[in-house]
């Protein structure tokens, strides 16, 4: 009713609230030094301290550097927001074999299903492609557009398709759109509105550059703002986001107010020595024999997993493929098995990390 408007405008005379005509309700007035986490704050917990650009406020109210997605094999999935880190994921055509907080430490190109196998589940940014044997009566060469090639002479085991195992897939640990692990944990400490970044995955474009608001003496709810490229870590400290400026690194997730930038090795390389939110040493992928050499696909968010060939048919890793040209990257092969018994029962996902031994053959990388 119009006659009620003047009364509402004063919010019942409560000086700690103001009337927002846009939403037609009384909103809590954030104390000086604090910034609202939503358009119309309702309580002190809807206010927060302001971090620097490329920093986010973590669950311990620390300004923490957002991760960056500057590595060539990473793309930004969600931007750096006031309360959550930028999130990076492997770029289209690649999947994450080694996850990292808000990013991926290692991206591999999606595998191409070998001859006689067809794609059961296309690859994603988190999982490699899952292959299965071609149906009886269907030419294995052209059972799928991705597999329109002559079958190899080797026999293909008629077995169940093998998904990427949780141990090597980041599917169970990669952040989902709509909030990071940090942001989810922070929710218990910092109440968020339904339209806050962590609930819709659409971070506010305003990192806290709005006009200064009062923060009264003795207020215990004033939250700080970190510098740009810093994030508020779990301990409530403003911590520098890692830099992905090295030539062999790309940004996986950007720096947000409450999570670090994360870096990973650029396409064609894998991480030999990991580091917090980054990789200390990247090395080129090993190049393997034709049976398991894969080429990057132009399909976004695809990757491949297939069963190991029978014992005794394992290919060696060669210096280059048959055409003599090094591929853009290769997927690790099944020659990573160190336990022959395991090879009889356990399929090896193509996401298994590898390192080159002195003989040039890939060995299992426990790191």
């Amino acid at each position: 009713f119009p006659q009620d408007r003047p009364f509402e405008d004063t919010c019942h005379g409560n000086p700690s609230h103001y009337y927002d005509k846009a939403v037609r309700r009384c909103c809590y007035r954030c104390p000086m030094g604090l910034f609202p986490t939503q358009q119309c704050p309702q309580r002190p917990t809807d206010c927060r301290k302001q971090c620097e650009p490329d920093y986010y406020l973590d669950e311990a109210d620390r300004c923490t550097a957002c991760v960056t997605c500057s590595r060539d094999d990473l793309v930004e999935k969600t931007p750096c927001a006031w309360n959550s880190s930028r999130v990076c994921e492997c770029r289209p055509g690649m999947f994450c074999s080694t996850s990292a907080v808000n990013s991926c430490a290692r991206c591999f190109f999606h595998s191409v299903c070998p001859a006689g196998m067809i794609v059961k589940f296309p690859g994603t940014a988190q999982k490699n492609t899952v292959c299965e044997p071609a149906s009886p009566g269907v030419s294995p060469a052209c059972a799928s557009p991705e597999n329109c090639k002559e079958p190899s002479s080797g026999t293909i085991p008629q077995a169940k398709p093998t998904p990427v195992s949780p141990a090597t897939s980041s599917a169970s640990t990669m952040p989902v759109r709509g909030g990071t692990r940090l942001a989810q944990e922070a929710a218990s400490k910092l109440t968020r509105a339904p339209d806050s970044p962590s609930s819709v995955g659409r971070p506010s474009s305003d990192p806290g550059l709005s006009p200064t608001q009062p923060c009264p003496e003795g207020s215990g709810d004033c939250r700080k703002q970190c510098e740009p490229d810093y994030y508020l870590d779990e301990a409530g400290r403003c911590t520098a986001c890692v830099s992905c400026s090295r030539d062999d690194l790309v940004e996986k997730t950007p720096c947000a107010w409450n999570s670090s930038r994360t870096c990973e090795c650029r396409p064609g390389m894998i991480c030999a020595t990991s580091a917090t939110n980054s990789c200390a040493r990247c090395v080129p992928y090993p190049i393997c024999a034709a049976e398991t050499v894969t080429k990057p696909q132009d399909m976004a968010e695809k990757d491949t997993t297939f069963e190991a060939p029978p014992l005794g048919t394992q290919p060696d890793c060669n210096p280059t493929p048959e055409n003599g040209e090094a591929p853009a990257s290769t997927s690790p092969t099944q020659s990573l098995l160190v336990d022959s018994q395991a090879s009889k029962t356990l399929p090896i996902p193509t996401s298994a990390p590898v390192a080159l031994s002195s003989t040039g053959k890939p060995v299992l990388d426990a790191g």
Partner: antibody
Framework: EVQLVQSGAEVKKPGSSVKVSCKAS????????MNWVRQAPGQGLEWMGQ????????NYNGKFQGRVTLTADKSTSTAYMELSSLRSEDTAVYFC????????????WGQGTLVTVSS | EIVLTQSPDSLAVSLGERATINCRAS??????????MLWYQQKPGQPPKLLIY???NVESGVPDRFSGSGSGTDFSLTISSLEPEDIAMYFC?????????FGGGTKVEIK
């Protein structure tokens, strides 16, 4: 009224340390980052670092990391800057300055403290 | 760190005339649609005084003859009509990355 009042001038020997204080009043001390900036005679400004008095969080300029320590005492609303292993090139006026939340500017400055390093 | 190159080093302008100081950053200062460039005025024996924040916003209490412009890497401070009290050193500062850095300063004098 917001005020930042710094301690008096100091003369120090090379290799020693100096601790400059900055007493704040007129605002919620714990809720604003306190920055420290120095200016050598006739030279430009150099950002040293900042501290968030609410929890002691700090950012430092890497050039000073290890030599500068920023602290804050909430009970007296006083920020401190300690610089160790002094050398002659540390002779400068040291300023404390409050950083605005929102645009990262430094809106209120102390009057400055001259630190002279001489043998 | 981000390097700020301020020019000119000194500037002699007649009273009532326009004075323009430039500041170029070694990398972009853009952040969520704003540029984290600040301008300060410093007179002898005094601490710096904030003039402009976010590249173009004039601080409260600063005369409207002061204005800031620019984005990305190139910025400028303009005094539309120089007054005697404007004789001072002027510094640009970036807050886009830690460590925060300042330009070398521009001395404004009366011609």
């Amino acid at each position: 009224e917001v005020q930042l009042v710094q301690s008096g001038a100091e003369v120090k020997k090379p290799g020693s340390s100096v601790k400059v204080s900055c007493k704040a009043s007129g605002y919620a001390f714990s809720s604003y980052w306190m920055n420290w900036v120095r200016q050598a005679p006739g030279q430009g400004l150099e950002w040293m670092g900042q501290i968030y008095p609410g929890d002691g969080d700090t950012n430092y300029n890497g050039k000073f990391q290890g030599r500068v320590t920023l602290t804050a005492d909430k009970s007296t609303s006083t920020a401190y800057m300690e610089l160790s292993s002094l050398r002659s090139e540390d002779t400068a006026v040291y300023f404390c300055a409050r950083r605005i939340n929102g645009n990262f500017a430094m809106d209120y400055w102390g009057q400055g403290t001259l630190v002279t390093v001489s043998s | 760190e981000i390097v700020l190159t301020q020019s000119p080093d000194s500037l002699a302008v007649s009273l009532g005339e326009r004075a323009t100081i430039n500041c170029r950053a070694s990398e972009s200062l853009e952040y969520y649609g704003t540029s984290l460039m600040l301008w300060y005025q410093q007179k002898p024996g005094q601490p710096p005084k904030l003039l402009i924040y976010s590249a173009s916003n004039v601080e409260s209490g600063v005369p409207d003859r002061f204005s800031g412009s620019g984005s990305g890497t190139d910025f400028s401070l303009t005094i539309s009509s120089l007054e005697p009290e404007d004789i001072a050193m002027y510094f640009c500062q970036q807050r886009r990355k830690v460590p925060s850095t300042f330009g070398g300063g521009t001395k404004v004098e009366i011609k």
